[in-house]
């Protein structure tokens, strides 16, 4: 045996963004001749492991969220660990609102800003575009929860959603915003780039949207502290239909 065995990959099926109450399976994919697998949950103060190549979570709860990694053993030798998988619970807080300024119908060459707003003093926002395979380039400056898209092209057409969360609980996200359809109007827009149907949020768990942008806001407001215990975050806590006053 020369050098460590190559690392496996760890996948979440159907997605690593899991609405509370939904099922998810983590699967460690190594070579066919791997003898045994170890799956670890990497949580400071509580790093734990299970000797399986998969972990089935029938009902997603907040204590399932976090970072996971896996390794395999072959002829008594261990592989390098997989890249860490971030399993995110969504729907922990009520959904933010997503809007486009000046409009969601925008001519090519103009600028548009997508604005994600939460009723909580959250300091993190994530914007997803359905169907993208790579993260969008980050802008040079952040404007609170604004995602500026400079010089719109037809490729920017599509369906967007955003989530909000606190950096103190990075794996507990809000429900997704209602979808925002951005239509790039004008001669360079083709029918295939304009969505004909807005997918239902209920199918969130069955798609793998790629992260487009993440935004850490700078604000003079004191961010709300969210402490997470095995029982859950406090405050605020709840499914998307529960509402709380904005923290100070």
């Amino acid at each position: 045996q020369h050098g460590p065995l190559p690392k496996p990959s760890l996948q979440a099926q159907p997605s690593s963004l899991v609405p509370l109450g939904h099922p998810v399976t983590l699967r460690c994919l190594g070579p066919s001749d791997a003898d045994l697998y170890r799956l670890e949950k990497v949580k400071p103060g509580k790093l734990i492991f299970i000797d399986q190549d998969f972990l089935f979570i029938p009902i997603m709860e907040i204590n399932n969220a976090g970072r996971y990694r896996c390794s395999y053993q072959n002829e008594s030798h261990w592989s390098l660990p997989s890249d860490q998988l971030e399993l995110i619970a969504t729907g922990v807080y009520s959904k933010p609102s997503l809007s486009a300024h000046p409009s969601s119908a925008i001519p090519p060459g103009r600028d548009v800003t997508l604005k994600c707003q939460s009723q909580y003093s959250f300091d993190e926002f994530v914007l997803y575009k359905e169907g993208d395979t790579r993260p969008y380039k980050r802008p040079e400056k952040w404007y609170r929860a604004n995602f500026p898209v400079i010089t719109v092209t037809a490729a920017h057409s599509g369906t967007y959603r955003c989530y909000s969360f606190s950096s103190s609980s990075p794996y507990l996200w809000s429900a997704p915003s209602d979808p925002l359809v951005v239509v790039v109007t004008g001669p360079s827009a083709t029918p295939s780039q304009v969505p004909t149907e807005v997918p239902s949020p209920m199918t969130e768990a069955s798609r793998r949207p790629s992260m487009l942008l993440t935004n850490k806001i700078s604000t003079t407001e004191k961010p709300m502290n969210i402490t997470v215990s095995p029982e859950g975050p406090s405050p605020p806590f709840g499914f998307a239909h529960q509402h709380y006053a904005k923290g100070n």
Epitope: V42, L47, I48, D51, W78
Partner: antibody, heavy 123, light 112 residues
Framework: QVQLVESGGGLVKPGGSLRLSCAAS????????MSWIRQAPGKGLEWVSS????????DYAASVKGRFTISRDNAKNSLYLQMNSLRAEDTAVYYC????????????????WGQGTLVTVSS | QSVLTQPPSVSGAPGQRVTISCTGS?????????VHWYQQLPGTAPKLLIY???NRPSGVPDRFSGSKSGTSASLAITGLQAEDEADYYC???????????FGGGTKLTVLG
């Protein structure tokens, strides 16, 4: 209450063999990872070997690999360490230790230890 | 030589505060693995003192506390008492070969 009782230690010549046993009681033995940890006279603790709850996952310290074999019998609530090709540097008190477990997850620490059994390798 | 590095000895007078350091590497403590501490009183088996970096099992006085940062950890004992005189060991796990690793141990002497 949780009890771990080691036995089988004694005096053995270099190159000889010895089999240590650990009798467990007071908990569901088959649910827990188990380990052997040793301590040479006047020295620190050294992890020797671990075995998974079902006996499939087995790991050894490099210093004993190929010479020692860990095993368990869940029906008898017992952990074993077969030690072959013993050397003077294997002289130590050998402790049997239980790993903490919660629900289906195992932890990387030892929450209960036996009192140990002394193995002396000398000609 | 132990994978985790501890000072061989520390000492303090009754009532004082002492700390014991434990230094690892990027493949153990720095790889996210927790640090656990054991107390071994003279002539007895080790006993779990701190688990998961900073948690105390029931029955362990709150004079004992643990912390972890980066690739190192420390154990603090406040209000030192004569019965705290013992050997203290840190323990973690190493990702390279999935082996359990200990520090070399620190002998605590309570003066006077």
């Amino acid at each position: 209450q949780v009890q771990l009782v080691e036995s089988g230690g004694g005096l053995v010549k270099p190159g000889g063999s010895l089999r240590l046993s650990c009798a467990a009681s007071g908990f569901s033995f088959s649910d827990h990872y188990m380990s052997w940890i040793r301590q040479a006279p006047g020295k620190g603790l050294e992890w020797v070997s671990s075995v998974g709850s079902e006996g499939k996952f087995i790991d050894y310290a490099a210093s004993v690999k190929g010479r020692f074999t860990i095993s368990r019998d869940n029906a008898k609530n017992s952990l074993y360490l077969q030690m072959n090709s013993l050397r003077a540097e294997d002289t130590a008190v050998y402790y049997c230790a239980r790993h903490y477990r919660e629900f289906r997850w195992h932890y990387y620490y030892f929450d209960y230890w036996g009192q140990g059994t002394l193995v002396t390798v000398s000609s | 030589q132990s994978v985790l590095t501890q000072p061989p000895s520390v000492s303090g007078a009754p009532g004082q505060r002492v700390t014991i350091s434990c230094t690892g590497s990027s493949s153990n403590i720095g790889a996210g693995y927790d640090v656990h501490w054991y107390q071994q009183l003279p002539g007895t088996a080790p006993k779990l003192l701190i688990y998961g970096n900073s948690n105390r099992p029931s029955g362990v006085p709150d004079r004992f506390s643990g912390s972890k940062s980066g690739t190192s950890a420390s154990l603090a004992i406040t209000g030192l008492q004569a019965e705290d005189e013992a050997d203290y060991y840190c323990q973690s796990h190493d990702l390279g070969a999935h082996v359990w690793v200990f520090g070399g141990g620190t002998k605590l002497t309570v003066l006077g």
